[in-house]
């Protein structure tokens, strides 16, 4: 007697980049003989009970091709990760994994004046944000003179894999001889956010 088989074919790239708030349709076709008995989609060790459907490609008696679709709606930055489709029949098990990355606009997590006189800005987003610094004298918040950071680090995120990437950047405020405003601008392909520190007044954050 021939041994059974399952062959899975992804209908979308197995590495997927999706923007925050968008949908994505994870779709596979698979060949199974004998007929499939169990199918499931899993994310973070949790099984989806809805949002997916599984059906034969045709209604012919001899059909061995099937389709499974997982419809992810309004994905959040915290919902990136590995989504796995598993299918089994009486002879074999098979699986395919999709790595989903959610692109998110940077958010500035902290913006501090440290005791050593450094100004530090920490931002999170995906793809990894870039942090630029600008200074403008006086009280204007239209800063154009760029300032080179003293230190830039990519921090390990405490969140799950595929989550936002955290970047920390610092500048030395002792270089500024006048009162004024310092802008920390975090940006990536999705968008940008700025925080402003006024030497004479308390800090304030203005997302753009």
């Amino acid at each position: 007697v021939d041994k059974g088989f399952i062959n899975i074919f992804p209908m979308i790239n197995t590495t997927v980049f999706v923007n925050d708030g968008e949908n994505v349709d994870l779709i596979v076709e698979y060949e199974a003989f004998p007929k499939p008995e169990h199918q499931q989609w899993i994310y973070m060790n949790r099984t989806f009970t809805d949002k997916w459907e599984d059906y034969p490609k045709s209604e012919n008696e001899s059909n061995i091709r099937y389709v499974s679709e997982l419809h992810l709606t309004r994905l959040k930055g915290t919902e990136g990760g590995t989504y796995t489709f598993l299918v089994s029949n009486s002879d074999v098990n098979a699986a395919i994994a999709f790595n989903v990355y959610v692109n998110t606009k940077p958010e500035i997590l902290t913006y501090d004046r440290l005791v050593n006189g450094m100004l530090q800005c920490v931002a999170a987003g995906f793809p990894e944000p870039t942090i630029d610094w600008y200074f403008c004298p006086g009280t204007e918040q239209r800063c154009s003179a760029s300032v080179l950071p003293v230190d830039v680090q990519t921090l390990n995120s405490s969140g799950p894999p595929f989550g936002k990437l955290v970047v920390q950047s610092s500048i030395d405020s002792s270089a500024f001889k006048h009162n004024g405003t310092v802008e920390c601008k975090a940006y990536n392909d999705v968008g940008k956010t700025s925080a402003y520190f006024n030497f004479a007044f308390k800090e304030q954050i203005h997302p753009h």
Epitope: I12, V16, N19, I27, H71
Partner: antibody, heavy 113, light 107 residues
Framework: EVQLLESGGGLVQPGGSLRLSCAAS????????MQWVRQAPGKGLEWVSG????????VYADSVKGRFTISRDNSKNTLYLQMNSLRAEDTAVYYC??????WGQGTLVTVSS | DIQMTQSPATLSLSPGERATLSCRAS??????LAWYQQKPGQAPRLLIY???NRATGIPARFSGSGSGTDFTLTISSLEPEDFAVYYC?????????FGQGTRLEIK
């Protein structure tokens, strides 16, 4: 801002061909199952065809099977519908849409001698 | 193919009233049901997806319910701009079918 812009409609004689295009912007086109839906004048909506994100699998309504071909070019963010052997009953506004609810404004196809 | 039947075909109500539109599938479509609104000369607009989830930007007066074969769209208090044609749509088992529509008109 999400936009789906259909083009390629027009007047064609029975038995003729047309190719519709749908240019997508404002969302990650390559992640979406796309579809064509049509609406005959004064009538309801009729699903025509669908295509998976990779373009590797397609499905058609019985009324157009063997005559219409759906395809996509993810590098150009564009969906296509090749319509052959057109009939009077194919006269309709053709919409491209995502499975998730984004729709274009439609392009009118008129099949008449 | 799964058939979708909407009722009533026409519903005549006044602004401020509650509207209840029904959609029945010829076989179970689980919760894979959407509701669309269409005004003359315009493309359909998604109101509800997966039977009960409001689409982005849709006012809270629109709500959906049901699963399996019987579904309902409720508009709690009609606004003048709500008078239009409403379609239900299923997307189960790879195919997609629409109901024939319910015309909501001003009484």
């Amino acid at each position: 801002e999400v936009q789906l812009l259909e083009s390629g409609g027009g007047l064609v004689q029975p038995g003729g061909s047309l190719r519709l295009s749908c240019a997508a912007s404002g969302f990650t086109f390559s992640n979406y199952l796309m579809q064509w839906v049509r609406q005959a004048p004064g009538k309801g909506l009729e699903w025509v065809s669908g295509i998976v994100p990779s373009g590797g699998s397609t499905v058609y309504a019985d009324s157009v099977k063997g005559r219409f071909t759906i395809s996509r070019d993810n590098s150009k963010n564009t969906l296509y519908l090749q319509m052959n052997s057109l009939r009077a009953e194919d006269t309709a506004v053709y919409y491209c849409a995502t499975r998730g609810g984004y729709w274009g404004q439609g392009t009118l196809v008129t099949v008449s001698s | 193919d799964i058939q979708m039947t909407q009722s009533p075909a026409t519903l005549s109500l006044s602004p401020g009233e509650r509207a209840t539109l029904s959609c029945r599938a010829s076989q179970s479509v689980s919760s894979y049901l959407a509701w669309y609104q269409q005004k003359p000369g315009q493309a359909p607009r998604l109101l509800i997806y997966d039977a009960s989830n409001r689409a982005t930007g849709i006012p809270a007066r629109f709500s959906g319910s049901g699963s399996g074969t019987d579904f309902t769209l409720t508009i709690s208090s009609l606004e003048p701009e709500d008078f239009a044609v409403y379609y239900c749509q299923q997307r189960s088992n790879g195919g997609i079918t629409f109901g024939q529509g319910t015309r909501l008109e001003i009484k």
